[in-house]
Interface confidence: medium
């Protein structure tokens, strides 16, 4: 057996070798719904006598209460390994993001390094065509915006089920119409590596001018 | 989950058959259906896609103006209507549905590339 | 419009051993590349899509890597299961004129 180390003064911690949590993946990308687990792990040195738990922490903002997070604690004759397991189930797109852990030692507070998750999933929709009522062959506008990730994100406009556009837009997309003399259904079509995404269609209706 | 195809059979050069693709456990119109043809000993062909809730087809240039597919969202059923049918259309049919998309939002067509769910096939046979 | 090129067209190897099948695409596809293994009198079943991911329910001795252009199906550990051939595919186009393109197949014989 060992014996307790003597309790470090704050003078003498600056002599302690520098503890930093060990090197992990960076970059998780997956599929939305899919599980993701990832993990922080630290070795304290017996010389440390004062630290806290791991934190969680994504974009800046701890993360408290409903998050799966697991503390596994080894220790042996020279000290302790820690590791935190994070783990999400069936992830979303509002869990992509930057998670690093944090850790209090001796009062110096060590950051790990940051894992990025990158939820991909077919296209959003954040901007698509509205129906308006225009004047007969007077030029409008319609508008068509999505996102990734996975991006680029391409769009193609889709008017009474033919194609507008040959050639794709990087979204976001405005489409000019020239005019029209009859009603007409346009929608557009987001595509990205992941899939496409078909908009609702939407009625482009001629004023009756009495 | 599965797709049934039937309607196959022996038919002379120049008549027409109409394919069935019956799907059940499926939310119909939240997926794309093709069909996909395999000439004896050959590979797999892809000829048509339907997007029954959006009423959205697509063809291989190949049956394009020649082959109609169609769907009774009711009975959720896929159609593949093949009129003047030639030796070269001799293949098992199938019938295969989109992968799954749980991430989209209702009132929007997904289309994600890629083929899950198969039904076993049915046989066309055109002698001439 | 791509073209998918499958090589070998069969391949030959003993139970326990590994194969590689290679799918090159005539033109960029990113990763929207699909690997699926069809047995005789059955219809296709999906491995991989988005060039690399597991289907569910299927097993990691079949391994997806590629883009672009090259891709790759490696089946390590080879199983009397796993003689059939293999199909890689793509998409391309939009929805109401876009295509499903398959390659030729790689027929594999497990000794």
């Known amino acids: 057996a060992h014996t307790a180390a003597p309790q470090v003064t704050s003078t003498a911690s600056k002599l302690l070798p520098p503890v930093a949590f060990n090197h992990t993946i960076g970059h998780i990308v997956l599929s939305e719904h899919k599980n993701v687990k990832f993990n922080c792990s630290i070795n304290i040195p017996n010389t440390y006598q004062e630290t806290a738990g791991i934190s969680w922490w994504k974009d800046g903002k701890e993360l408290l209460g409903a998050h799966h997070s697991i503390t596994q604690f080894y220790p042996d004759e020279e000290g302790v390994s820690i590791i935190a397991l994070f783990s999400i189930a069936s992830v979303q797109r509002s869990d992509n993001g930057s998670y690093f852990c944090k850790m209090k030692v001796n009062n110096r507070e060590i950051v790990s390094d940051p894992i990025y998750v990158e939820v991909q999933g077919l296209p959003y929709f954040i901007k698509q065509p509205e129906s308006v009522n225009v004047t007969r062959n007077t030029a409008f506008n319609l508008t068509c915006q999505a996102v990734g990730p996975p991006e680029p994100v391409n769009i193609f406009w889709v008017q009474n089920s033919s194609r507008v556009n040959e050639k794709p837009e990087r979204s976001p997309s405005v489409l000019t119409v020239p005019g029209l003399t009859e009603t007409a259904v346009f929608s557009c079509e987001a595509h990205n590596d992941k899939g496409l995404t078909v908009s609702k269609g939407v009625h482009i209706n001629i004023k009756v001018i009495p | 989950q599965e797709l049934v195809e039937s309607g196959g059979g022996l038919v002379q050069a120049g008549e027409s058959l109409k394919l069935s693709c019956k799907a059940s456990?499926?939310?119909?119109?939240?997926?794309?259906i093709s069909w996909v043809r395999q000439a004896p000993g050959k590979g797999l062909e892809w000829i048509a896609y339907?997007?029954?809730?959006?009423?959205?087809?697509n063809y291989a240039h190949s049956v394009k103006g020649r082959f109609t597919i169609s769907s009774d969202n009711a009975q959720n059923t896929v159609f593949l209507q093949m009129p003047s049918l030639t030796a070269s259309d001799t293949a098992t049919y199938f019938c295969?549905?989109?992968?799954?998309?749980?991430?989209?939002?209702?009132?929007?067509?997904?289309?994600?590339?890629?083929?899950?769910?198969w039904g076993p096939g049915t046989l066309v046979t055109v002698s001439s | 419009d791509p073209v998918l090129t499958q090589t070998p067209s069969s391949v030959e190897a003993a139970v326990g051993g590994t194969v590689t099948i290679k799918c090159q695409a005539s033109?960029?596809?990113?990763?929207?590349l699909a690997w699926y293994q069809q047995k005789p009198g059955q219809p296709p079943k999906l491995l991989i899509y988005?060039?690399?991911t597991l289907a569910s329910g299927v097993s990691s001795r079949f391994k997806g890597s590629g883009s672009g252009t090259e891709f790759t199906l490696t089946i390590s550990d080879l199983e009397c299961a796993d003689a059939a051939t293999y199909y890689c595919?793509?998409?391309?186009?939009?929805?109401?004129?876009?295509?499903?393109?398959f390659g030729g197949g790689t027929e594999v014989v497990v000794k």
């Open positions: 295969a549905r989109d992968l799954d998309y749980t991430g989209g939002v209702v009132g929007y067509a997904y289309v994600t590339y890629y083929f899950t769910l």
């Open positions: 456990g499926i939310d119909f119109s939240s997926y794309g």
């Open positions: 339907i997007y029954p809730g959006f009423g959205i087809t």
């Open positions: 033109e960029s596809i990113s990763s929207r």
């Open positions: 988005s060039a690399s």
């Open positions: 595919q793509t998409y391309y186009g939009g929805s109401t004129t876009g295509w499903y393109v």
